[in-house]
């Protein structure tokens, strides 16, 4: 069930790179950190799972991209966009954004200095 590959344009662009990686472990990792003992997330039970599972795979995926501020920011923006509708209130949105901005540091990457995580047309 692999996504469609090879968007038109420069194959080394951030868009192409973000499209190739699996950001779901990053999304789960952050959701687990902010939801803790919540019942269910996506159909995957996160009640008793170690966040390190998702974090290792998440960092591996982010590491696949060129380590530029712009590409890292695009990946974080994509994660935010993917999860926006699942975040139930403003407080949860802020928590998610805070954890998201900490993600590069957790993976020992440089955090993007300016990265707008506001999702256009959404609550986020």
């Amino acid at each position: 069930m692999r996504r469609e590959r090879g968007r038109q344009g420069d194959s080394s662009s951030c868009e192409r790179q973000v499209d190739r990686v699996n950001l779901k472990p990053c999304e789960q990792h952050i959701m687990q950190r902010i939801m803790g003992e919540q019942e269910q997330y996506d159909s995957y039970d996160i009640r008793s799972t170690r966040s390190s599972d998702q974090q290792q795979r998440c960092c591996d995926e982010l590491n696949e991209m060129e380590n530029t501020q712009r590409c890292m920011c695009e990946a974080l923006q994509q994660i935010m966009e993917n999860q926006c509708d699942r975040l139930q209130d403003r407080q949860m949105v802020q928590q998610f954004k805070r954890e998201l901005m900490n993600l590069p540091q957790q993976c020992n990457f440089r955090a993007p200095q300016r990265c707008d995580l506001d999702v256009s047309g959404g609550r986020c």
């Epitope: 692999r2 779901k24 789960q28 799972t49 170690r50 599972d53 591996d60």
Partner: antibody, heavy 123, light 108 residues
Framework: EVQLVESGGGLVKPGGSLRLSCAAS????????MNWVRQAPGKGLEWVSS????????YYADSVKGRFTISRDNAKNSLHLQMNSLRDADTAVYYC????????????????WGNGTTVIVSS | EIVLTQSPGTLSLSPGERATLSCRAS???????LVWYQQKPGQAPRLLIY???TRATGIPDRFSGSGSGTDFTLTISRLEPEDFAVYYC?????????FGQGTKLEIK
């Protein structure tokens, strides 16, 4: 047709070296993480090593760490396993396996396997 | 290292019966990273279930996976003659990506 074909197995003395190769065809090799998995005679499966698409992240089983080196050549659609300081316990069928993930939910899995190449370490 | 223990080691059943195979992890594993494979003698393993419960393409619906945390189960609702094989669970979330020792499903 999506296919993985391993080669390079054979008989080698303890302490010797071998280089296994895996030729991939029928898919965009550079879009997939790759793994080596082995199976000793009459035993179960043992994961050996994995390498990500760009080779930036590599993992090894403790049993082979420091002796085996995984590598890939995306231009040639090939995966390799350099095996040094071989031991009797390394005798096994070595499988090359492609790792994919479910785009909608995220899980990873090895969905394409080669038929394996046999490595025998014996004096 | 996460150790996966499968039970029973051997399961003897007849075609038409229900098979329940267990996989227990030494530490909690996210459902996202739990996979089941089938292997027949002289063949490479074949992907059955990923994400603990999602059937791979082409796998009959008599195969189902369930569980969470440290306890996972593969169920075959009505055994067909071609289902007799060895089944392995694997976790692929945390390196090293360990396999269970396998459960051999044999004809009674």
């Amino acid at each position: 047709e999506v296919q993985l074909v391993e080669s390079g197995g054979g008989l080698v003395k303890p302490g010797g070296s071998l280089r296994l190769s895996c030729a991939a065809s029928g898919f965009i090799f550079s879009d997939y993480n790759m793994n080596w998995v082995r199976q000793a005679p009459g035993k179960g499966l043992e994961w050996v090593s994995s390498i990500t698409r760009s080779s930036r992240t590599i993992y090894y089983a403790d049993s082979v760490k420091g002796r085996f080196t995984i590598s890939r050549d995306n231009a040639k659609n090939s995966l390799h396993l350099q095996m040094n300081s071989l031991r009797d316990a390394d005798t096994a069928v070595y499988y090359c396996a492609r790792e994919d993930f479910d785009v909608s939910t995220g899980p990873y899995y090895m969905d394409v396997w080669g038929n394996g190449t046999t490595v025998i370490v014996s004096s | 290292e996460i150790v996966l223990t499968q039970s029973p080691g051997t399961l003897s059943l007849s075609p038409g019966e229900r098979a329940t195979l267990s996989c227990r992890a030494s530490q909690s594993v996210s459902n996202m990273f739990l996979v089941w494979y089938q292997q027949k003698p002289g063949q490479a393993p074949r992907l059955l279930i990923y994400g603990a419960s999602t059937r791979a393409t082409g796998i009959p619906d008599r195969f189902s996976g369930s569980g969470s945390g440290t306890d996972f189960t593969l169920t075959i609702s009505r055994l067909e003659p071609e289902d007799f094989a060895v089944y392995y669970c694997q976790q692929n979330g945390n390196s090293p990506y360990t396999f269970g020792q396998g459960t051999k499903l044999e004809i009674k």
